[in-house]
Interface confidence: medium
Amino acid sequence: MHVAQPAVVLASSRGIASFVCEYASPGKATEVRVTVLRQADSQVTEVCAATYMMGNELTFLDDSICTGTSSGNQVNLTIQGLRAMDTGLYICKVELMYPPPYYLGIGNGTQIYVIDPEPCPDSD
Amino acid sequence: MHVAQPAVVLASSRGIASFVCEYASPGKATEVRVTVLRQADSQVTEVCAATYMMGNELTFLDDSICTGTSSGNQVNLTIQGLRAMDTGLYICKVELMYPPPYYLGIGNGTQIYVIDPEPCPDSD
């Protein structure tokens, strides 16, 4: 299953990055799982994951740094709280969980660049 | 003549970006000219240029946004005052001016990403 995502995204100076993850669904899935993986120096870690029913809202865990919305075969992902050390390749993994058959698709990754802001001068 | 430069550089939150432009000199040049070109949407503009004698300091014009130092066949370039709208591909062009023969080398470009900082809260 083909998954498309942008090649490069710049995080805002507040450490927020948003990108769209779009998948070409081969069937009529009702339950979809989206996982964001981060790769840096060949280390792969799971950033966040959400399972949603088509037409419903994505629900990440309360303490997740991700939020998102879905529209058809598109998922709009936002990652917050990013710092310069979080710069890396963020890969969108989409799984069609239900009904069978199970389908899996993995995007080529979005390189997210993060620059730490200069601290503001003291206001005292 | 081969010219090497990094593929990607992030400007600091103060709008400063630095990168090294390295050239493989086929001869013993004494006078070298370095030009930084910016390409965005197939438009190419000259950002800055400097001619220097090997072993001496690079001298850009007083109102130039570039500064630099040289060491052997390496030129360390710094571009200041960058804003988000200046994001683009910055190409290093090196010319060996003297003695003959003249040599020209052009790098593949360094993609410089610039993020405008959030304004600091008023201190009044």
């Epitope: 083909h2 998954v3 870690t45 058959p101 389908y103 899996l104 698709g105 | -």
Partner: nanobody, 126 residues
Framework: QVQLQESGGGSVQAGGSLRLSCAAS????????MGWFRQAAGKEREGVAA???????SYADSVKGRFTISQDNAKNTLYLQMNSLEPEDTAMYYC????????????????????WGQGTQVTVSS
């Protein structure tokens, strides 16, 4: 539905060889990666080797020069030739598959794979 079935595991002396096979069925992707992973008792599952549809391969540093991954597309079978086996290679070996070529080119992480076999045990004694 994709199904993977490993075979070829067993017990061998250090320095010996084994050849693992993985029969794949129900696979319809035009581009894909397949890989071998292993999990020793009490340890996390780790990547051993992966190969994508154009034959590009990647190996874990610990097996480079000793293990070779290959595939026979006509038979829908994945192989892992293991030579110069060491006691540290003792583990359950799993065959895995994923859509796209990404996993073989970049990182041998189980997070990139979604289809798994049941595993075959390899034991290397000194």
């Amino acid at each position: 539905q994709v199904q993977l079935q490993e075979s070829g595991g067993g017990s061998v002396q250090a320095g010996g060889s084994l050849r693992l096979s993985c029969a794949a069925s129900g696979y319809t992707y035009s581009s894909y990666s397949m890989g071998w992973f292993r999990q020793a008792a009490g340890k996390e599952r780790e990547g051993v080797a992966a190969i994508d549809s154009d034959g590009s391969t990647s190996y874990a540093d610990s097996v480079k020069g000793r293990f070779t991954i290959s595939q026979d597309n006509a038979k829908n079978t994945l192989y892992l030739q293991m030579n110069s086996l060491e006691p540290e290679d003792t583990a359950m070996y799993y065959c895995a598959a994923t859509a796209g070529w990404y996993a073989a080119r970049h990182a041998l992480s189980p997070l990139f794979f979604g289809y798994w076999g049941q595993g075959t045990q390899v034991t290397v004694s000194s």
